[in-house]
């Protein structure tokens, strides 16, 4: 169900504070704009108020998309989706946000990485990712290369490799050359998920060839 309201909310934290405390899809408004976007809000995990910016769970959505698609978002907020780089960039440049990445493997294990500071640069700077203050159970070293890299897609090669990481590993991501993670890689089902260089990778938790079962990237204001 879509949960719409006359109020304007910039993120799921504002939705939560307005009294909407159930998980679901809500309409958010771009900062300093009337443009709207649909996002899934997790109102239960870790106190709620989380804006889901990425979800992988079943391979139902193709993540080998263009720069424009990653800019505006794609997929279904109730399932697999990418919220959109432009919205996330605008949002995270308004105030300080934390980023939590929740991961599941095929053996029933779960882990997370929490970054206490997160923002994306503007499109002019290729939505470069900035992260600080890593804690969590998915590795003491960041699987997103630091300092952050520019975002790359199959039609927008901004990585640090003479190869084209997005074409080789599939999906849009903040590739280095090509780096220790890609949560937007190919979805591989159980028993086909090992020794896959182009899968859903978080190196400092499961190594380079392991493709994960499920991932969620979520953001919330640091002062929530």
């Amino acid at each position: 169900d879509y949960k719409d309201d006359d109020d304007k909310f910039r993120d799921c934290a504002e939705v939560f504070k307005s009294g909407h405390t159930t998980n679901g899809i809500y309409t958010l408004t771009f900062p300093n704009s009337t443009e709207e976007i649909k996002a899934y809000c997790d109102m239960e995990a870790g106190g709620g108020g989380w804006t889901i910016i990425q979800r992988r769970e079943d391979g139902s959505v193709d993540f080998q998309r263009t720069w424009k698609e990653y800019k505006v978002g794609f997929g279904n907020p109730s399932g697999e989706y990418w919220l959109g780089n432009e919205f996330v960039s605008q949002l995270t440049n308004q105030q300080r946000y934390v980023l939590k990445i929740h991961l599941k493997d095929w053996e029933g294990n779960e882990a997370y990485s929490l970054y206490e500071h997160f923002y994306l640069s503007s499109e002019e700077l290729n939505y470069r990712i900035h992260l600080k203050g890593l804690t969590g159970t998915a590795g003491k070293i960041s699987s997103i290369s630091q300092p952050g890299n520019d975002f790359s897609t199959k039609d927008g090669d901004n990585d640090k490799c003479i190869c084209k990481c997005s074409q080789m590993l599939t999906g849009g991501w903040w590739f280095a050359a090509c780096g220790p993670s890609n949560l937007n890689g190919m979805y591989y089902p159980q028993r086909q998920n090992t020794n896959k260089f182009n899968g859903i990778k978080w190196y400092y938790w499961k190594g380079s060839g392991y493709s994960l079962k499920a991932t969620t990237m979520m953001i919330r204001p640091a002062d929530f």
Epitope: N93, R96, H117, Y119, S121, E124, L125, R128, H130, K132, G133, L134, T135, K140, I141, S142, Q146, P147
Partner: antibody
Framework: DVQLQESGPGLVKPSQSLSLTCTVT?????????WNWIRQFPGNKLEWMGY???????SYNPSLKSRISITRDTSKNQFFLQLNSVTPEDTATYYC??????????????WGQGTSVTVSS | SIVMTQTPKLLLVSAGDRVTITCKAS??????VAWYQQKPGQSPKLLIY???NRYTGVPDRFTGSGYGTDFTFAISTVQAEDLAIYFC?????????FGGGTKLEIK
């Protein structure tokens, strides 16, 4: 290539204000990152003073908060340090530097060559 | 503020030696620790960021490690041009703070 250059008076009288300019070339200070002032006292101790981010927000060292102001002139791609009510203990080499994160403190990858300031009557 | 206690203050070494400098944070700094080199008459230069990442163009004889409160910086084979003061810096919490420095002198 990114370059930073400090400028300002080398001698300031006690109780007066210290004003320094950092001119940045090769990168727009409104594009990204935070733009810092750091000082190094005789004896080599380093102290972070504060920054102005690409968005214009500022953060200061609490030990200086009542005396410090960092501003910028985006048309000239410059940012400034003003330190009020100086004493001889403010004698130091002052550096401007770019940090690798735009909304918070972080490591600093580009530094100016530094300018020496003496506070004395 | 997080206090960064850096040891030793002075290192007297010969070319070819391996040297190690340590920094201890008064509380956890996660992996948000950098190491700088300052040669005589110059400004500090970033060598290592996020505890273990070598900055662009930095020779691989310089390495960093650590997490939480204990951090180590090493030069595997000291060269004459490594004469400098080395500083650690935490930027996990504001204000960022520096260690007192280690002066590396060549015998």
């Amino acid at each position: 290539d990114v370059q930073l250059q400090e400028s300002g008076p080398g001698l300031v009288k006690p109780s007066q204000s210290l004003s320094l300019t950092c001119t940045v070339t090769g990168y727009s200070i409104t594009s990204d990152y935070a733009w810092n002032w750091i000082r190094q006292f005789p004896g080599n101790k380093l102290e972070w003073m504060g920054y102005i981010s690409y968005s214009g927000s500022t953060s200061y060292n609490p030990s200086l908060k009542s005396r410090i102001s960092i501003t910028r002139d985006t048309s000239k791609n410059q940012f400034f340090l003003q330190l009020n009510s100086v004493t001889p203990e403010d004698t130091a080499t002052y550096y401007c530097a770019r940090s690798t994160f735009g909304h918070y403190v972080s490591s600093m990858d580009y530094w100016g060559q530094g300018t020496s300031v003496t506070v004395s009557s | 503020s997080i206090v960064m206690t850096q040891t030793p203050k002075l290192l007297l070494v010969s070319a070819g030696d391996r040297v190690t400098i340590t920094c201890k944070a008064s509380q956890s700094a996660s992996n948000d620790v950098a190491w700088y080199q300052q040669k005589p008459g110059q400004s500090p230069k970033l060598l290592i960021y996020y505890a273990s990442n070598r900055y662009t163009g930095v020779p691989d004889r310089f390495t960093g490690s650590g997490y939480g409160t204990d951090f180590t910086f090493a030069i595997s084979t000291v060269q004459a041009e490594d004469l400098a003061i080395y500083f650690c810096q935490q930027d996990y919490s504001s204000p960022p703070t520096f260690g007192g420095g280690t002066k590396l002198e060549i015998k």
